[in-house]
């Protein structure tokens, strides 16, 4: 079945969600009017026919984009530095795991299209988030909306990873 995502990858993803939750600085109840439809490409994570290359590519691009988003001067000014450092470290570890897996999957001949297409879609999605933050002048509420949006999209992506893992288990036991 090719590269198995390291067993602790799912744990790292959950830790990232926990960290994002802990990073909350203001009550989201103050920010209702700042909600925005970022149009997360749900079709990318909802399919039942999950290819390993696709799943890994989506997760890799998601984590890369989250890392970039939270690795800026603006982000450093907005968040608790201790939690931000922990987030960076966790994301870096996950990215290393995924890069190893992606190289192996590509080496096994899975289509490059399965890898490049999600990346482009996700870059557009994250660009929309960056534009929103700039429009809102990087306000506390804008960052809070973005934090919750990232938690949602990461949660959906992690679910996709879990579905792939359980599919692999089913195939392995049959």
């Amino acid at each position: 079945l090719g590269c198995d995502l390291p067993q602790n990858h799912g744990l790292l993803s959950r830790n990232t969600l926990v960290l994002l939750h802990q990073m909350r600085r203001i009550s989201p109840f103050l920010c209702l009017k700042d909600r925005r439809d970022f149009r997360f490409p749900q079709e990318m994570v909802k399919g039942s026919q999950l290819q390993k290359a696709h799943v890994m590519s989506v997760l890799h691009e998601m984590l890369q984009q989250i890392f970039s988003l939270f690795h800026t001067e603006r982000s450093s000014a907005a968040w608790n530095m201790t939690l931000l450092d922990q987030l960076h470290t966790g994301l870096h570890q996950q990215l290393q795991h995924l890069e190893t897996c992606l190289l192996q999957v590509v080496g096994e001949g899975e289509s490059a299209g399965a890898i490049s297409s999600p990346a482009l879609t996700l870059r557009r999605y994250f660009q929309g988030i960056r534009v929103y933050l700039k429009e809102k002048k990087y306000s506390d509420c804008a960052w809070e909306v973005v934090r919750m949006e990232i938690m949602k999209s990461l949660f959906l992506s992690t679910n996709m990873q879990e579905r792939l893992r359980s599919k692999d288990r089913d195939l392995g036991s049959s």
Partner: antibody, heavy 121, light 107 residues
Framework: EVQLVQSGAEVKKPGESLKISCKGS????????IGWVRQMPGKGLEWMGI????????AYSPSFQGQVTISADKSISTAYLQWSSLKASDTAMYYC??????????????WGQGTLVTVSS | DIQMTQSPSSLSASVGDRVTITCRAS??????LNWYQQKPGKAPKLLIY???SLQSGVPSRFSGSGSGTDFTLTISSLQPEDFATYYC?????????FGQGTKVEIK
Amino acid sequence: EVQLVQSGAEVKKPGESLKISCKGSGYSFTSYWIGWVRQMPGKGLEWMGIIDPSDSDTAYSPSFQGQVTISADKSISTAYLQWSSLKASDTAMYYCARHPGLNWAPDFDYWGQGTLVTVSS
Amino acid sequence: DIQMTQSPSSLSASVGDRVTITCRASQSITGFLNWYQQKPGKAPKLLIYAASSLQSGVPSRFSGSGSGTDFTLTISSLQPEDFATYYCQQSHDFPLTFGQGTKVEIK
């Protein structure tokens, strides 16, 4: 299948305390807020307050602040609405409903079946 | 608090009629407006969110429009099951507030 199941009807006397519940299933309970809405007999809908079950942060309508307490136990995916001293004017149907928080999604897309609270001496 | 005013408070119509209900906010709520349908003894049901987005599973005869302070719910061709009370609700800011309701009755 997403469901919000509320506790059964209650008949109470003025001055008594009460806690009604709303149990969520079929979705990630901590990813949505839970709101409470009152409907007095023959009247319209009134928003009472809301809770974020992930950390129990709450917001109340000024009309209900200090009159009721909203809480949640995320370990059992349940939100609560409670009164320490009921009044006859609390007689109403109470609904819970889920809210997507700051995420862009339909507001109050799923509702509980309602809990009828009757307060009478 | 943001006040929501619905009109009319009740209306009589026949099956097949086009029905329009309006909702006015006391200040701009941009597009943060929802419409609900409630039948006697039942919980409210979400029809339209974000002023014009049709909730999944809701028939396309229901539509919503408007932004800022003035909003409209339209039922293009009233069906027997549409006789109910309709509420608008703003979700622009806390406290969330509902309109007083519009009862749609059979003529």
